[in-house]
């Protein structure tokens, strides 16, 4: 059998291999050692017994899409049946105190490979033997601790294969410089050690994509915006656009990246080298946002110009044809740069919203029949922008972290946007008050610290930022400026 007979449904063409030469990979026309690595078709009854206690699942993931020329990394993780795990020696053991259908196991081992490998007859003293080889006969690499690696992974794509000895998780990186653009298929077959041979335990496949477009994502955020994912934002407040470039192999690390923005509101083009930009829309409506990212990245060198055509020679003496009969143009081993582009387009809607909220006055309310532990305080609030439809107050500890009470209620506010919010405080002390005004599209927040005095008639009201004062005194509460923080990870700058 050949590798393509074992690993794929169809024999890949030589054309596919020639057009996608992967460094360090081998042609799937090579012979497969079926004696050492038996081949079972899908549905073969032997799969049922390929693993003690159930089936092993292989999960294949990649960091696709990959910009052509960059590395793409594939990770295979083996998921064992319930209660099974790989130990430090590479043996498969039952987890302690874990109960599966078979109950608790007396034997701690599912597979004790250490014991098997110590029985090392047939080896020639170097640790090399006829069974420590891959399906194509190549010997296992003798890394430190290689004996604890009991799984053989065979990766197959584009008519080529790559063999790897590993534990329950392996990763393989492939350079995509010679890979045809578009979606491709990666298939992985996993074998486990079984005495002096191997047994297939899992097969998995996944599509990956190679592209010449920089994969670009943009996050959009705005203070007071109620829902950042609906692409509806508020007029007269800056929107922060943050560009994330998917470049897990850091291919573009040394590239100069330019960001060209068109916000769709006739403000022209804005070119920046910063991945973050702020823009304020001053009109309501729907706008088409366009971003072009440009990076000078390592790329193929253009072929040298062809020599001038020679006049036909009278003698038909052809030179040796063996070297390069197909004229496969060589790509010089130079560091050429090529401009790569990425694009992002979004339609965003701009609406009125609550732009700002301020507490302008805080008043202790005199109660005719004071409760033993209760104080009422009125907050006089103003806002700018659209008219709020609800108000929420969150009362918490002085650090503003532990919520003690949260109340939301509808409000009916006139055009002046002046309202009084009355809230009860249980007991004396310092409180953090978060006050939020909201409508359909926006939420505006302000915070203040307030000090509620003892109800002891002898004591006077204490404020957060002042000395004493009478019960009816009006005081300015200490303001806490509040900003929503967005944390992003970037590969660049």
């Amino acid at each position: 059998k050949r590798f393509h007979d074992v690993l794929g449904n169809e024999r890949p063409s030589a054309y596919m291999r020639e057009h996608n030469q992967l460094n360090g990979w081998s042609s799937d026309e090579n012979d497969w050692n079926e004696k050492l690595y038996p081949v079972w078709k899908r549905g073969d009854m032997r799969w049922k017994n390929s693993w003690k206690g159930g089936r092993v699942q292989a999960v294949l993931t990649s960091d696709s899409p990959a910009l052509v020329g960059s590395n793409i990394t594939f990770v295979v993780n083996l998921v064992f049946p319930r209660c099974q795990k790989e130990d430090a020696n590479g043996n498969i053991v039952y987890e302690k105190n874990c109960r599966n259908e078979a109950g608790l196991s007396a034997d701690p081992y599912v597979y004790n490979w250490t014991a098997w490998s110590e029985d090392s007859d047939g080896e020639n003293g170097t640790g090399q033997s006829h069974h420590n080889v891959f399906p194509d006969g190549k010997p296992f690499p003798h890394h430190p601790g290689w004996r604890r690696w009991n799984f053989v992974y065979v990766f197959h794509t584009l008519g080529q294969y790559f063999q790897k000895l590993g534990r329950c998780s392996v990763r393989v990186s492939v350079n995509t410089a010679n890979v045809t653009l578009g979606p491709q298929l990666m298939e992985v077959t996993v074998y486990r050690r079984h005495g002096r041979a191997y047994v297939p335990i899992a097969q998995v496949k996944d599509v990956y994509v190679v592209t010449d477009q920089i994969p670009v994502f943009v996050t959009m955020s705005q203070k007071n915006d109620r829902n950042s994912s609906d692409e509806t934002f508020l007029k007269d407040l800056p929107i922060t656009f943050d560009v994330l470039i998917h470049d897990p192999s850091h291919f573009l690390n040394y590239s100069t990246i330019n960001y060209k923005w068109s916000f769709g509101d006739n403000t022209g083009l804005f070119v920046s080298i910063n991945h973050t930009v702020n823009h304020t829309y001053v009109l309501n409506g729907t706008f088409s946002l366009n971003l072009t990212v440009k990076a000078a990245a390592p790329g193929p060198c253009p072929p040298p110009p062809p020599p001038p055509p020679r006049p036909p020679k009278p003698t038909p003496s052809l030179g040796p044809a063996g070297d390069n009969p197909l004229g496969l143009s060589e790509i010089p081993d130079e560091n050429c740069q090529i401009n790569r582009y990425g694009h992002f387009q979004a339609t965003i809607t701009i609406v009125e919203g609550i732009l700002e909220v301020n507490i302008i006055q805080t008043t202790d309310v005199l109660m005719l029949v004071p409760g033993p532990d209760s104080s009422l305080i009125d907050f006089v609030v103003t806002c700018q922008g659209s008219i709020p439809t609800e108000v929420c107050t969150i009362i918490s500890d002085p650090t503003c972290e532990i919520t003690q009470n949260a109340v939301c209620s509808p409000v009916d506010v006139d055009e002046m946007c002046l309202l009084t919010v009355r809230r009860a405080f249980n007991g004396s002390g310092t409180y953090c008050v978060n006050l939020t005004l909201g409508d359909d599209t926006s939420l505006a927040l302000t915070s203040t610290l307030i000090s509620v005095p003892d109800r002891d008639p002898a004591s006077s009201l204490r404020m957060a930022n002042s000395g004493g004062g009478g019960l009816n005194d009006i005081f300015e509460a200490q303001k806490i400026e509040w900003h929503e923080h967005h944390h992003h990870h970037h590969h660049h700058h």
Epitope: E10, S13, E18, L158, T180, S329
Partner: antibody, heavy 119, light 107 residues
Framework: QVQLVQSGAEVKKPGASVKVSCKAS????????MHWVRQAPGQGLEWMGE????????NYAQKFQGRVTMTVDKSTSTVYMELSSLRSEDTAVYYC????????????WGQGTLVTVSS | DIVMTQSPDSLAVSLGERATINCKTS??????LAWYQQKPGQPPKLLIY???YRYTGVPDRFSGSGSGTDFTLTISSLQAEDVAVYYC?????????FGGGTKVEIK
């Protein structure tokens, strides 16, 4: 939809060169190899070579090696095939054809360009 | 180079009857073989790729079969519009090569 539009018919003298263009639209130009296939009057199809618009790698059939040059203009999504030292047996319809991913079968063809070599 | 031998050179079949065209390759190209239909003054049109896969929009009276070095294109019930020249092409390796063509006519 995918379209390959070729340049018009040419009449050339023996020994001259001809440059045929093939303008692609309706797909990502750099993602697919472009091939050239010719057909002499009343004869079968003959593959001449291919070019990758992304990196301008080329493969030419041995028969045309040294006489054919395939080039790309990415800005206009156009592929060119230049054949030099023309002789009468080069009289043919020249087609550009787009391969599909890693498979060299041709679902999309240009309309063809007749090149006549005559003294 | 892989040599493609197509047979017969021409074929006359009654309307509604079966037409069979063969293509033999000088080495194993399985399953990388395509079939095309060409009418006068037009570029070829892809019918079958990878031996047996019918291309989008191709009527199901066209089918491809075979493996290794022997392949067949079958038109199960010949229609008037099927009159054309049919070519096989190996897409296994470069240089890509075509068969000499089979002319299908109505008897």
């Amino acid at each position: 939809q995918v379209q390959l539009v070729q340049s018009g018919a040419e009449v050339k003298k023996p020994g001259a060169s001809v440059k045929v263009s093939c303008k692609a639209s309706g797909y990502t130009f750099t993602s697919y190899w472009m091939h050239w296939v010719r057909q002499a009057p009343g004869q079968g199809l003959e593959w001449m070579g291919e070019i990758n618009p992304y990196d301008q790698r080329t493969n030419y059939a041995q028969k045309f090696q040294g006489r054919v040059t395939m080039t790309v203009d990415k800005s206009t999504s156009t592929v060119y095939m230049e054949l030099s030292s023309l002789r009468s047996e080069d009289t043919a319809v020249y087609y550009c054809a787009r391969s599909t991913g890693n498979y060299a079968w041709f679902a999309y063809w240009g309309q063809g360009t007749l090149v006549t070599v005559s003294s | 180079d892989i040599v493609m031998t197509q047979s017969p050179d021409s074929l006359a079949v009654s309307l509604g009857e079966r037409a069979t065209i063969n293509c033999k390759t000088s080495q194993d190209v399985s399953p990388s073989l395509a079939w095309y239909q060409q009418k006068p003054g037009q570029p070829p049109k892809l019918l079958i790729y990878s031996g047996s896969y019918r291309y989008t929009g191709v009527p199901d009276r066209f089918s491809g079969s075979g493996s290794g070095t022997d392949f067949t294109l079958t038109i199960s019930s010949l229609q008037a519009e099927d009159v054309a020249v049919y070519y096989c092409q190996q897409h296994y390796s470069i240089p890509l090569t075509f068969g000499g063509g089979t002319k299908v006519e109505i008897k």
